[in-house]
């Protein structure tokens, strides 16, 4: 189920690559964030807190990613036209409860000016 399109700028282009921003409420302490391309899982990141507030970050499908207190950024490099697709941030909230899954996304348009290695 798609909960909605992202209510923020999800794609940030730089240097022939794209940063895909997946936001989560900053109150959330433990969660899993997956980046989906169409229906395929491209990347995932899980943040858990153990005893003594020790934070653990795990990735089963690793992508270059960056975690902040309210977002996960996934980075895709060497853009080409095949990257054009619907991308979704699939957030599973574990703590604080209730458990909640949300799917938000948008379409990544690829324009010539954003490609990594343009022929001059």
């Amino acid at each position: 189920e798609i909960n909605g399109s992202a209510n923020y700028e999800m794609f940030i282009f730089h240097n022939g690559g794209v940063q895909i921003l997946c936001k989560y409420p900053d109150i959330v302490q433990q969660f899993k964030m997956q980046l989906l391309k169409g229906g395929q899982i491209l990347c995932d990141l899980t943040k858990t807190k153990g005893s003594g507030n020790t934070v653990s970050i795990k990735s089963l499908k690793f992508c270059h990613s960056q975690l902040s207190n309210n977002s996960v950024s996934f980075f895709l490099y060497n853009l080409d036209h095949s990257h054009a697709n619907y991308y979704f941030c699939n957030l599973s909230i574990f703590d604080p409860p209730p458990f909640k899954v949300t799917l938000t996304g948008g379409y990544l348009h690829i324009y010539e000016s954003q490609l990594c290695c343009q022929l001059k």
């Epitope: 409420p25 900053d26 109150i27």
Partner: antibody, heavy 121, light 106 residues
Amino acid sequence: QVQLVQSGAEVKKPGSSVKVSCKASGYTFTDYAMHWVRQAPGQGLEWMGLISIYSDHTNYNQKFQGRVTITADKSTSTAYMELSSLRSEDTAVYYCGRNNYGNYGWYFDVWGQGTTVTVSS
Amino acid sequence: EIVLTQSPATLSLSPGERATLSCSASSSVSYMHWYQQKPGQAPRLLIYDTSKLASGIPARFSGSGSGTDYTLTISSLEPEDFAVYYCFQGSGYPYTFGQGTKLEIK
């Protein structure tokens, strides 16, 4: 139906502590976090903090850090908010509120009826 | 701290009229929620995620906005709508409420 029932009104002396309770019913207590919010007379609402019932993780508004302690007793489905070193400006109605999420954010979906705490010498 | 400024502080209208309440944030927030409070009662959730109607809330209530400017609209006021309305942001810690708009009968 989902209900949050709070303890009765309290009158406290400056420098003392107060502990307000919030008993949940109509849902599985550990499946939601609980927030505390206060409202001074004629004033707006102020978020104090929350507790994740199943992990015991707490998150406090820095304004109250060191003075507020939020706890929960799973066996009785009751959340507690204790405020210490009371001063006259802590006179307020204290509310518990259940945590919930939308697609983008979190909010309080169910509230207790409120507990009036009066701090007076 | 993100400061939420609600305007007007008091709004005097008659039943059947349209009410527009504003909430301005001191910096950008991702979403806004709205609560209604009547004297001697706890607040009640009206709108969450900027525009979604909470369970049991009549369709005359609606919310909109983005960034720093958000609006609660009541399309045609009913007698039971006269109350205090608060906006709330949970985007930036510490989480804050507006000071409230009192909607009173003209």
